[in-house]
Interface confidence: low
């Protein structure tokens, strides 16, 4: 195991000072997490070039909203969001959107401030296709009986244990190389009883647990 | 550790003009927004200028449109304000600060003073 | 432009609670962040986007933002926080300072 540790201590510090060398450097984020932290997730089209607005540190970008999957509370009857708006520099963290494909439909997990759509390049969002069907499934359901109960705790580093039976170690970092893996892909942290969070399988069946994955704290 | 140290400040009479440097080290210079604050004797911070980590977006506060200019040379690490027109409400320490990821300004410089007096 | 007020003072025992309240129109739909500033030193951000703390930054400061109004709460309050501290705010032109709150440990 020491061997094993040794190398990704080694991987993660050198992950790390790449990280710190940028101005925006992004923590690596579990998809519920993102569902849980934002305030509006929605399926959208981007329409265009960002629109600088004058005399501001904001540019904005003009979207066709398809679905919302969480916000309507926040939101309440309103129709839908035409605009995301987003730092103009990227060294803010600000979003630079590269596809020119208007009609490939996104997945958007942003922040409602004044009534608008705010994303970063911190923000889950991701091509609604990329994301697999079990993912695409927890958006618009599962994650969110998850929110405000469980949490996704992320071991970075070995060793690393939990620090409460609401939190799921999060370990596709360690064991995959890559915040995209099976966690993240295939299961949701969701609560097994009032006192306790496990996680669950996306599949067919929501009973089967992931082996190993929760460790004794 | 990050380090940002400015000078050029000093004495000079209204009308005059007044340049400011902020020399930067222990980060990825080019890759940061940077922004001046300063703060009169006695009183609370006033956000003055702010420019883009390629130099290539600049912003100012309405109080020194047209009057000031930031600007920053990224093979020097060093970033630049200068001053012109100037007046005496314009006394005030002139600090040297970068922007975290999003808007907070995460680490500051200790100031230079510059004095706007006949 | 917003405009941000903050008490002119605040005073706490060491040991209690201090709470530092910022208010502008609308407030809590735009982020917050919060400065401490010791006499002839530099600000140092404590909190930034409402209420996240920047590493190195004790857990006992801590904000929130809703409505009109930002807090920077600071539980157990030691000597050492004994500072100026000042909300700073952004609508879509620019920062904005609030007045300052000079904090006395008691």
């Known amino acids: 195991m020491a061997p094993f540790a040794s190398l990704a201590s080694g991987i993660l510090l050198l992950l790390s000072l790449i990280a710190s060398s940028k101005a925006c450097s992004c923590a690596p984020t579990h998809p519920q997490t993102a569902f849980c932290n934002s305030d509006l997730v929605i399926r959208a089209k981007f329409m265009g070039s960002p629109e600088i607005i004058e005399t501001t540190l904001y540019q904005r970008y003009e979207i066709k909203m398809t679905k919302m999957l969480k916000g309507f509370d926040a939101v309440g009857n309103a129709t839908g969001f035409r605009f995301a708006y987003t730092p103009a520099m990227e060294s803010l963290c600000g979003y630079v959107h590269k596809s020119q494909n208007r009609s490939e439909e996104f997945l958007i997990a942003g922040r409602l401030r004044n009534g608008n759509l705010h994303i970063t390049a911190c923000s889950f969002l991701v091509p609604w296709h990329n994301l697999s069907p079990a993912q695409q499934k927890a958006f618009v359901k599962t994650y969110s009986a998850g929110c405000g109960v469980c949490t996704v705790f992320p071991c970075s580093a070995i060793p690393c244990k939990l620090e409460s039976d609401s939190h799921c170690l999060w370990t596709d970092q360690i064991l995959m190389g890559s915040e995209k893996g099976y966690q993240s892909d295939h299961f949701a942290c969701l609560p097994r009883n009032p006192d306790l969070c496990t996680w669950q399988y996306l599949g067919v069946s929501m009973t089967r647990s992931l082996p190993l994955a929760k460790a004794e704290a | 550790q990050v380090q940002l140290v400015e000078s050029g400040g000093g004495l000079v009479q209204p009308g005059g003009s007044l340049r400011l440097s902020c020399a930067a080290s222990?980060?990825?210079?080019?890759?940061?927004?940077m922004s001046w604050v300063r703060q009169a004797p006695g009183k609370g911070l006033e956000w003055v200028s702010a420019?883009?980590?390629?130099?290539?977006?600049?912003y100012y506060a309405d109080s020194v449109k047209g009057r000031f200019t930031i600007s920053r040379d990224n093979s020097k690490n060093t970033l630049y304000l200068q001053m012109n027109s100037l007046r005496a409400e314009d006394t005030a320490v002139y600090y040297c600060?970068?922007?975290?990821?999003?808007?907070?300004?995460?680490?500051w410089g200790q100031g230079t003073l510059v004095t706007v007096s006949s | 432009d917003i405009e941000l007020t903050q008490p002119p003072s605040v005073s706490v025992a060491p040991g209690q609670t201090a709470r530092i309240s910022c208010s502008g129109d609308?407030?809590?739909?735009?982020?917050a962040s919060w400065y401490q500033q010791k006499p002839g030193q530099a600000p140092v951000l404590v909190i930034y986007?409402?209420?996240d703390r920047p590493s190195g930054i004790p857990e006992r400061f801590s904000g929130s933002n809703s409505g009109n109004t930002a807090t920077l709460t600071i539980s157990g309050t030691q000597a050492e926080d004994e500072a100026d501290y000042y909300c700073?705010?952004?609508?879509?032109?620019?920062?904005?300072f609030g007045g300052g709150t000079k904090l006395t440990v008691l």
């Open positions: 600060a970068r922007y975290g990821a999003y808007f907070g300004l995460d680490y």
């Open positions: 222990g980060f990825t210079f080019s890759s940061y927004a």
């Open positions: 420019i883009s980590g390629s130099g290539g977006s600049t």
């Open positions: 609308a407030l809590g739909d735009k982020y």
């Open positions: 986007d409402d209420s």
């Open positions: 700073q705010s952004y609508d879509f032109n620019f920062h904005v």
